[in-house]
Interface confidence: low
């Protein structure tokens, strides 16, 4: 018996061929011997089956001795053995219809789980294998779960259903809702304007929700809410904003915040959360601010950084075009009785300068100048 696999909602064509290459009488029946369709001369006739409005044939092929049964908008319950009667012969075709659906919305938050459910006819024992856009293979039976979705899981999932050495492929488009970056770090000299950006890694026609930026300053004992906002159809409106610092927020996506001045008391890390309408859970992005200050007090030239720096970062003080006078894996360095000239304070990671502040040291009878 020939086996044909079909997909729910698709169209399938079951073939039936006579030895005579001409139009002769044929009938298609189901396993209950109920007529589905057949011919009377050059006319298509239909029986009382449930397929009535979805069954068809190709009259253009009858003259060649081909009498296909076409079933449109396939349903799982269309799975059956179909019998073609032609020339006193019976051709049997077993049709198995499968459906594969995401049992939740196909727009999922990063970290959430995706469950794909296979609808299959009774008595079948299919296996399912899905391949994610990043090439991960996931194998399962009637249900297939992927926990902790990542940004790279966005895109087309290709799922293969295997049954009786036959296979049918499904494609499901999944959108993982997330920020483009899980974390970012901004390095600024004291007094500079700070720009924080939170680009989303997906596009949807309408985006509605609410968000908040909580900030943990390095010098503070507890975190505080810096700003809360609403998002309506991609338009941003601020609800509450702290008075210190005086944050400003852009009115359009991507979410964009401006801190007028980088000051040591603001150095630290924040967590922006975004709750989207009709979604459980929130999107998160961490943002870090490192602030540098170079000062000269009497005979002491000091360079300090505040904020979340990694232990491998190097802080150096050097006279322009000279070797570093002092270089340490610490958050403050200083030089006593510095020579006159332009001094550079450098924060670097494996030789790459992340932040630089210059301070001019004048001869001892003058006061220092900070450019």
């Amino acid at each position: 018996k020939k086996v044909v696999l079909g997909k729910k909602g698709d169209t399938v064509e079951l073939t039936c061929t006579a030895s005579q290459k001409k139009s002769i009488q044929f009938h298609w029946k189901n396993s209950n011997q109920i007529k589905i369709l057949g011919n009377q001369g050059s006319f298509l006739t239909k029986g009382p089956s449930k397929l009535n409005d979805r069954a068809d044939s190709r009259r253009s092929l009858w003259d060649q001795g081909n009498f296909p049964l076409i079933i449109k908008n396939l349903k799982i319950e269309d799975s059956d053995t179909y019998i073609c009667e032609v020339e006193d012969q019976k051709e049997e075709v077993q049709l198995l219809v499968f459906g594969l659906t995401a049992n939740s919305d196909t727009h999922l938050l990063q970290g959430q789980s995706l469950t794909l459910t296979l609808e299959s006819p009774p008595g079948s024992s299919p296996s399912v294998q899905c391949r994610s856009p990043r090439g991960k293979n996931i194998q399962g039976g009637k249900t297939l779960s992927v926990s902790q979705l990542e940004l790279q899981d966005s895109g087309t999932w290709t799922c293969t259903v295997l049954q009786n050495q036959k296979k049918v492929e499904f494609k499901i488009d999944i959108v993982v809702l997330a920020f483009q970056k899980a974390s970012s770090i901004v390095y600024k000299k004291e007094g500079e304007q700070v720009e924080f950006s939170f680009p989303l890694a997906f596009t949807v026609e309408k985006l509605t929700g609410s968000g908040e930026l909580w900030w943990q300053a390095e010098r503070a004992s507890s975190s505080k809410s810096w700003i809360t906002f609403d998002l309506k159809n991609k338009e941003v409106s601020v609800k509450r904003v702290t008075q210190d610092p005086k944050l400003q927020m852009g009115k359009k996506l991507p979410l964009h915040l401006t801190l007028p001045q980088a000051l040591p008391q603001y150095a630290g890390s924040g967590n922006l959360t975004l709750a989207l309408e009709a979604k459980t859970g929130k999107l998160h992005q961490e943002v870090n601010l490192v602030v540098m200050r170079a000062t000269q007090l009497q005979k002491n030239l000091t360079c300090e950084v505040w904020g979340p720096t990694s232990p491998k970062l190097m802080l150096s003080l050097k006279l322009e075009n000279k070797e570093a006078k002092v270089s340490k894996r610490e958050k403050a360095v200083w030089v006593l009785n510095p020579e006159a000239g332009m001094w550079q304070c450098l924060l670097s990671d494996s030789g790459q300068v992340l932040l630089e502040s210059n301070i001019k040291v004048l001869p001892t009878w003058s006061t220092p100048v900070q450019p």
């Epitope: 990043r134 991960k136 293979n137 194998q139 492929e169 494609k171």
Partner: antibody, heavy 120, light 111 residues
Framework: EVQLVESGGGLVQPGRSLRLSCAAS????????MAWVRQAPGKGLEWVAT????????YYRDSVKGRFTISRDNSKNTLYLQMNSLRAEDTAVYYC?????????????WGQGILVTVSS | DIQLTQSPSSLSASVGDRVTITCRAS??????????MQWYQQKPGKAPKLLIY???NLASGVPSRFSGSGSGTDFTLTISSLQPEDFATYYC?????????FGQGTKLEIK
């Protein structure tokens, strides 16, 4: 009998292009994913690219992304690999393979291979 | 990328010997109790030939003296009694993740 026959290889200068073809027979071509695997002279095997049964999805190894394009013509039972901006390190025997799937994907039939030499 | 390391890189054996080749993956190649590991045989100037798929399944037409075992990160190809036609290079290959990767190969020579 499954047969995969590659053609289109040869000597090409760095930076130039070449198009490999693979004529398939002995099986229903449109039911199978296909892939290209290469082997540099005296070296091991290296997967290059894969295309799904209907051509809608393609995968590439990082070193060829943006330079190579895998495609297929199911009406002609033919697989292609368009190779642009060729480099000396692309010199290899290129095998056309059929990609079968049980629980994993694997290469169950291979062509005889075609040599691509990139040299000035 | 998942790295596959085969050992030994080469070995000499005689007809009738039992031979074992191992393949170690840098991370697990298992999904839902399926081990996505294959073994191929390649003779000089010829295309590779599939021997074993999914760690232990024998490919069509492959003699039963070939067998595969292992799970997770450690896999083995065993030839129970070497035949003259078995002298070749053997490769393991994972298909858990893109890019598909192969081991560096094990050359089996006549002693």
């Amino acid at each position: 009998e499954v047969q995969l026959v590659e053609s289109g290889g040869g000597l090409v200068q760095p930076g130039r292009s070449l198009r490999l073809s693979c004529a398939a027979s002995g099986f229903t071509f449109s039911n199978y994913g296909m892939a290209w695997v290469r082997q540099a002279p005296g070296k091991g095997l290296e997967w290059v690219a894969t295309i799904s049964y209907d051509g809608s999805i393609t995968y590439y190894r990082d070193s060829v992304k943006g330079r190579f394009t895998i495609s297929r013509d199911n009406s002609k039972n033919t697989l292609y690999l368009q190779m642009n901006s060729l480099r000396a390190e692309d010199t290899a025997v290129y095998y056309c393979t059929r990609e079968e799937q049980y629980s994993s994907w694997y290469f169950d039939f291979w062509g005889q291979g075609i040599l691509v030499t990139v040299s000035s | 990328d998942i790295q596959l390391t085969q050992s030994p890189s080469s070995l000499s054996a005689s007809v009738g010997d039992r031979v074992t080749i191992t393949c170690r993956a840098s991370q697990s190649v298992s999904i839902s109790s399926h081990d996505l590991m294959q073994w191929y045989q390649q003779k000089p100037g010829k295309a590779p030939k599939l021997l074993i798929y999914d760690a232990f399944n024998l490919a069509s037409g492959v003699p039963s003296r070939f067998s595969g075992s292992g799970s997770g990160t450690d896999f083995t190809l065993t030839i129970s009694s070497l035949q003259p036609e078995d002298f070749a290079t053997y490769y393991c290959q994972q298909s858990k993740d893109d890019p598909y990767t192969f081991g560096q190969g094990t050359k089996l020579e006549i002693k």
